[in-house]
Amino acid sequence: GHSLFTCEPITVPRCMKMAYNMTFFPNLMGHYDQSIAAVEMEHFLPLANLECSPNIETFLCKAFVPTCIEQIHVVPPCRKLCEKVYSDCKKLIDTFGIRWPEELECDRLQYCDETVPVTFDPHTEFLG
């Protein structure tokens, strides 16, 4: 089963080359494990494959397979990264008819330094 509040090694191939190697679930979209996240992420992969933004792969991984630090914190992508990617990829998103998840709407994310990300506590985010 899925053990709550523990970091786990990344197993999603696309995200194994990221600068971080541990993740935590559920993610922002409420996907409960990496296999579900990988399937959902599949819909967005043409954006990465067609290189609409130099930051697209980083953003998708940080959103779907978030960084995990200090055991109980999930690190969502920063708002500036989201805005850059969404702006770069908007035309491609429309062309593919990709539904951008409301949880990833940029104005829901916080401004932060990508090197020192803002964290959120899954107790409050997911357990109310």
Epitope: L50, E51, K91, F96, G97
Partner: antibody, heavy 118, light 107 residues
Amino acid sequence: QVQLVQSGAEVKKPGASVKVSCKASGYTFTNNFMHWVRQAPGQGLEWMGGFDPEDGETIYAQKFQGRVTMTRDTSTSTVYMELSSLRSEDTAVYYCARVGRGYSFDYWGQGTLVTVSS
Amino acid sequence: DIQMTQSPSSLSASVGDRVTITCRASQSISSYLNWYQQKPGKAPKLLIYAASSLQSGVPSRFSGSGSGTDFTLTISSLQPEDFATYYCQQSYSTPLTFGGGTKVEIK
């Protein structure tokens, strides 16, 4: 209605360059990506690359990298494809194609035959 | 690069026949698969996009199905104007690649 009208046939010598134009009408030019596809005589379709007319950002097939340049003139809603260092294997019909839903090519130019011969 | 393999490369059929053309991708491409029809001396024409969506103005006898690696184009009742070459194309990843084509000839 959407129309893509290409320039006429060209005959070129090996080593030369060719520039094919494609004039778009019937839609907002900057709203859709534009790509180029070629077809050698009696052969299948081969993707060369494409770009976003809004910002000119290009993406080329590795095979043509360094030999192909795609540009646009937004004032006349025209896209251009220039292929340099031509060789006989480049003899083909060159098509411009607009990208539609699902990243399909929903409208095509009539094609431009480029013959490379010494 | 993703290889697209079409089969058969050619087929003979009669007006009214049900015709099925298959396209296989060398790796999963989800549903990012498009089908085109091309007649001699003419530009290709889009029939189906995103594996199963019928392009506006295309007769409903054309249909597409499949996802992942295996896709099918079906013409439910072949008409005289359908004799042409059909190509599949993946839009999942660059380089965008086409199948080798299937020529549908009159029996």
